[in-house]
């Protein structure tokens, strides 16, 4: 699986999950989140050559098409597969509120 | 929706479904499929700016991150959303066999 265990410990050039830290204030302009100040969101990057973690029948066909037509602009793309939530704390007035933000952290990628 | 109805009738530059015809023999090297000789597989292409058909919380965050950090390599990617099957006919000896191939045709795209 193209997950953090594999990708963070390898020098994989093809589609894999990469490290990305997002600072809520600096990178998103969100000043209202109290905790955390930012988080390891990660992102997916890398080419999707033939047979590389292909998602559907279509992505297999497209990768094979790409192999036969190397100059074509039609190619599978490296995108998130498994996403995890992130708990945040923010204030409503003086009252802290804990919220679970779904699908915030990329754990693995796929070629789609 | 970034589907064939909208995308094929517009000059949309952002993420949209594009026309692509795949010839089984020439483009994939599959000589054994009798009918059809090829099919309109389509593909997804175009940038994914902030708020453009974003798939998850994460892709919204990433598009916003990208807006704040224009040089970054982390950005959502335009990929298939709705896929449709394709019926094919091939011969097993002299006997024709009809098979429904799942997830073969792109009907719409999303930013993931």
């Amino acid at each position: 699986a193209l997950d953090t265990n594999y990708c963070f410990s390898s020098t994989e050039k093809n589609c894999c999950v990469r490290q990305l830290y997002i600072d809520f204030r600096k990178d998103l302009g969100w000043k209202w989140i109290h905790e955390p100040k930012g988080y390891h969101a990660n992102f997916c990057l890398g080419p999707c050559p033939y047979i590389w973690s292909l998602d559907t029948q279509y992505s297999k066909v497209l990768a094979l098409y790409n192999q036969h037509n190397p100059g074509a602009s039609a190619a599978p793309c490296c995108v998130p597969q498994a996403l995890e939530p992130l708990p945040i704390v923010y204030y409503v007035g003086r009252k802290p509120k804990v919220e679970q933000l779904s699908n915030m952290i990329v754990r693995s990628c796929k070629c789609s | 929706a970034l589907d064939t109805n909208y995308c094929f009738s517009s000059t949309e530059k952002n993420c949209c479904v594009r026309q692509l015809y795949i010839d089984f023999r020439k483009d994939l090297g599959w000589k054994w499929i009798h009918e059809p000789k090829g099919y309109h597989a389509n593909f997804c292409l175009g940038p994914c700016p902030y708020i453009w058909s974003l798939d998850t919380q994460y892709s919204k965050v990433l598009a916003l991150y990208n807006q704040h950090n224009p040089g970054a390599s982390a950005a959502p990617c335009c990929v298939p959303q709705a896929l449709e099957p394709l019926p094919i006919v091939y011969y097993v000896g002299r006997k024709p066999k009809v098979e429904q191939l799942s997830n073969m045709i792109v009907r719409s795209c999303k930013c993931s």
Epitope: Y50, Q57 | W30, K31, W32, G93, K95
Partner: antibody, heavy 121, light 111 residues
């Protein structure tokens, strides 16, 4: 060059299952049908079935239907043949063989080295 | 199923001999202008090797002393001048009908 490398010999008890692997290299794995053929000791060749790796489409010989499953892992270009409810008359050398590509059922131009499966109590 | 009958089941021959092996199918294997009949060679302990496909087409890398002919139900594999490396078992195979079937084999031995 095209190569099909099969897993090693197996000894199984009657009623058990066996899974033989066949790793392909030197060609586009998803563009050709992969066949499985067996040969009992001193006997002729018997076709078991086939699979098209890109689509997972299968055709099984009637004699093996319900007892055999053919699968592939396109990420490793490997084909698998699992035979269940083994009997002593399943003792044979099992071959994977690539179809030449013009039809589903076809001549077979490249063969694995064979895997001997012995079924004995 | 289409039955494939090879004859003879074995034969003895000398180096330089012309050898002919026949294969008869229980029904015609002709379709779409092709004869769906193929020939293989197998040596002891080895996998079969494709010699001839579609009745008369020589597989790449196979010596030209091997040739195939026939149509309908009757087919022939000919070795024009037998060489020491040709001593082996030969099989015919049809693919016009599911299941794909092989002949029982012809063993070519040294006289």
């Amino acid at each position: 060059q095209v190569q099909l490398v099969q897993s090693g010999a197996e000894v199984k008890k009657p009623g058990a299952s066996v899974k033989v692997s066949c790793k392909a290299s030197g060609y586009t794995f998803t563009s050709y049908w992969m066949n499985w053929v067996r040969q009992a000791p001193g006997q002729g060749l018997e076709w078991m079935g086939q699979i098209f790796p890109a689509l997972g489409s299968t055709n099984y010989g009637e004699m093996f239907e319900g007892r055999v499953t053919m699968t592939t892992d396109t990420s490793t270009s490997t084909a698998y043949m699992e035979l269940r409810s083994l009997r002593s008359d399943d003792t044979a050398v099992y071959y994977c063989a690539r179809g030449i590509g013009n039809y589903a059922l076809d001549a077979m131009d490249y063969w694995g080295q064979g895997t001997l499966v012995t079924v004995s109590s | 199923d289409i039955q494939m009958t090879q004859s003879p089941s074995s034969l003895s021959a000398s180096v330089g001999d012309r050898v002919t092996i026949t294969c008869r199918a229980s029904e015609s294997v002709d379709w779409w202008g092709n004869s769906f009949m193929h020939w293989y060679q197998q040596k002891p302990g080895k996998a079969p090797k494709l010699l001839i496909y579609l009745a008369s087409n020589l597989e790449s890398g196979v010596p030209s002393r091997f040739s195939g002919s026939g149509s309908g139900t009757d087919f022939t594999l000919t070795i024009s001048s037998l060489q020491p490396e040709d001593f082996a078992t030969y099989y015919c195979q049809q693919n016009i009908e599911d299941p794909l079937t092989f002949g029982g084999g012809t063993k070519v031995e040294i006289k």
